[in-house]
């Protein structure tokens, strides 16, 4: 019963992680720029995402522009896009694998095979979590490097956007959920004949070192 509860918790966490990841990838809030001109009238906030950039005027009016040419985009942005999409697809694949092996489904009858599928789904979710983490950390690193680079102009400097925090949350949830699914496998297989036990070895869930304190600027 505890094993089933852990499985459900694991899947709920990974689903939450997937939704977070989707929102993170879609929102144009990876990098945030607060540009205050000489006059308060031209105060504006620029949001930059993987697919588009938006300008929010002080009046509250927002204008978004989708990036035109794929080839003209910086390589790191192209890589971040690719990793984001791959991470989401990998997580979906993990969900399908889990559903095939879930206790409540009849796709597979053998408990041994079910347990193996759940373990596989857990590993796939962990991989998805790592893939989500890479572009988020890479972008955060670039923002922080610029923040401390004295030759990068103030107008070119960015802050960590909401999408990055969502991305970290998504990665954490996918890693945690995947880890829980990996941990349920030995008990899932232990109800069968004892010779199955040798086939499973518990592996500690991948631990993601969360971001330390990142700098943010205070605008007056």
């Amino acid at each position: 019963m505890a094993s089933a509860g852990m499985q459900i918790l694991g899947v709920v966490l990974t689903l939450l992680g997937w939704v977070n990841g989707l929102v993170s990838c879609a929102l144009p809030m990876w990098k945030v720029t607060a540009f205050i001109g000489n006059s308060i009238v031209v105060a504006q906030v620029v949001w930059e995402g993987l697919w588009m950039s938006c300008v929010v005027q002080s009046t509250g009016q927002m204008q978004c522009k989708v990036y035109d040419s794929l080839l003209a985009l910086p390589q790191d942005l192209q890589a971040a896009r690719a990793l984001c999409v791959i991470a989401l697809l990998v997580a979906l694949f993990g969900l399908l694998v889990y559903l095939a092996g879930a206790k409540c489904t009849t796709c597979v009858e053998e408990k041994d095979s079910k347990a193996r599928l759940v373990l596989t789904s857990g590993i796939v979710f962990v991989i998805s979590g790592v893939l989500t983490l890479i572009p988020v950390c890479w972008t955060a690193h670039a923002i922080i490097r610029d923040f401390y680079n004295p030759l990068v102009a103030e107008a070119q400097k960015r802050e960590l956007g909401a999408s990055l925090y969502l991305g970290w949350a998504a990665s954490g949830l996918l890693l945690l959920g995947g880890g829980l699914l990996c941990c349920t496998c030995p008990s899932g297989g232990s109800q069968g004949p004892s010779h199955y036990m040798a086939r499973y070895s518990t592996s500690a869930p991948a631990i993601s070192r969360g971001p330390s304190e990142y700098p943010t600027k205070n605008y007056v």
């Epitope: 910086p74 004295p150 030759l151 102009a153 107008a155």
Partner: antibody, heavy 119, light 107 residues
Framework: EVQLVESGGGLVKPGGSLRLSCAAS????????MSWVRQAPGKRLEWVVT????????YYPDSVKGRFTISRDEAKNSLYLQMNSLRAEDTAVYYC????????????WGQGTLVTVSS | DIQMTQSPSSLSASVGDRVTITCRAS??????LAWYQQKPGKSPQLLVY???LLVDGVPSRFSGSRSGTQFSLTISSLQPEDVARYYC?????????FGSGTKLEIK
Amino acid sequence: EVQLVESGGGLVKPGGSLRLSCAASGFTFEDYTMSWVRQAPGKRLEWVVTISSGGGRTYYPDSVKGRFTISRDEAKNSLYLQMNSLRAEDTAVYYCIRGDYRYDAFAYWGQGTLVTVSS
Amino acid sequence: DIQMTQSPSSLSASVGDRVTITCRASENIDSYLAWYQQKPGKSPQLLVYASTLLVDGVPSRFSGSRSGTQFSLTISSLQPEDVARYYCQHYYSIPYTFGSGTKLEIK
């Protein structure tokens, strides 16, 4: 108009010291990152030092670390470069540079002051 | 330290010619590259930053481009006032380094 005027250059013996000054005008001095870049005769440009706006952070290459010290006086709108333990290879024209809010890198350059280290 | 290799060291071209100066970084510097123009007896002047962005007031015949670790400064139609030495400089990380310069002359 941005104006940067360097002074304090001259002839100095190896191991000696020199203090370069840069008088800034035409802008709010404390708002900008300031730097020194030098150019030895017939050689490429070489970054010497950078100081952040407000003077909280300073950045040096290994070639001058421990020998050169950058400082700024907001009240006098002046930038200084204290050069100690000077060597022959420090001979160059030293440029005072202001950063910019919009542009990266070394945006505005002074006319330069010549430092000659020779016995 | 990141090395900046600039080529050619000198270049002679006719008025109206298209001229390209290249600069290669010894390792990845993203787009953290600036180009400077130094006219004879004058201080250097910033032309391009972030590898492709032109400083206000710089003629549109100047343009910058990037392909991996190779960067180019192109003058689409050379003018007599473009006679100068051109330097590239990275500002990806400390220490910031310059290229050796390209001396541009009119034939």
